[in-house]
């Protein structure tokens, strides 16, 4: 297992609709054709695998398990979007990248993106 650098933004604020997007960029030492991306959440004394996708370079990311994630890849960048977030989902979201094929296997883990989620205030009753 060889180490690889992964960069991601330090902080992201989710939209009022509970959507947060960030870029996960990895320094690929070679020409990988199969890449696995996993998003981990660290907060509330828990570590959660939020979503995971394995993709072939140039193809769309496919997430399993009715995932709250979607994403696209472009070169050594993965554009991740997490939706359906609630205030209780606030936490540190860590991007983990694995170069699966061809060998050798490379693993990179980012420092994490702190995603802040604020539940929207209910709309006040209006006479109009």
């Amino acid at each position: 297992c060889k180490a690889m650098h992964v960069a991601q933004p330090a902080v992201v604020l989710a939209s009022s609709r509970g959507i947060a997007s960030f870029v996960c960029e990895y320094a690929s030492p070679g020409k990988a054709t199969e890449v696995r991306v996993t998003v981990l959440r660290q907060a509330d004394s828990q570590v959660t695998e939020v979503c995971a996708a394995t993709y072939m370079m140039g193809n769309e990311l496919t997430f399993l398990d009715d995932s709250i994630c979607t994403g696209t890849s472009s070169g050594n960048q993965v554009n991740l979007t997490i939706q359906g977030l609630r205030a209780m989902d606030t936490g540190l979201y860590i991007c983990k990248v694995e170069l699966m094929y061809p060998p050798p296997y490379y693993l990179g883990i980012g420092n994490g993106t702190q995603i802040y989620v604020i539940d929207p205030e209910p709309c006040p009753d209006s006479d109009f």
């Epitope: 959660t48 979503c51 399993l64 398990d65 009715d66 609630r86 989902d89 979201y93």
Partner: nanobody, 126 residues
């Protein structure tokens, strides 16, 4: 309605291992995330681990990460909790529960789960 029945709890020495099982009945079992919680004497119930519908995604409490492994066999409608390097503080009644909604969450809280089973007692002696 999904019903969950836990088994496998027993008395074990510190450093030992146990595997808990949670058998489910109900047609919708494979559509839901399932989780384990525990309650020690005189303490509040706490989240332990969870696993997504297909078994590809997992969540762990920091206190058990690296020691416990959650898995599921959808063909057998069963979820497992493999517990290694057990400590006296792992002594508790362990419960299996079903997530209230289809899909997978970023965070896991006991309020998100229902259909808890009756529990199985795990006692770790020093």
């Amino acid at each position: 309605e999904v019903q969950l029945v836990e088994s496998g709890g027993q008395l074990v020495q510190a450093g030992g291992s146990l595997r808990l099982s949670c058998a489910a009945t109900g047609r919708t079992y494979n559509s839901y995330s399932l989780g384990w919680s525990r309650q020690a004497p005189g303490k509040e119930r706490e989240f332990v681990a969870a696993i997504s519908a297909s078994g590809t995604l997992r969540a762990y409490a920091d206190s058990v990460k690296g020691r416990f492994t959650i898995s599921r066999d959808n063909a057998k409608n069963t979820v497992y909790l493999q517990m290694n390097s057990l400590k006296p503080e792992d002594t508790a009644v362990y419960y299996c529960g079903r997530h209230r909604s289809v899909g997978w969450r970023a965070s896991h809280h006991l309020s998100d789960y229902d259909n808890w089973g009756q529990g199985t007692q795990v006692t770790v002696s020093s």
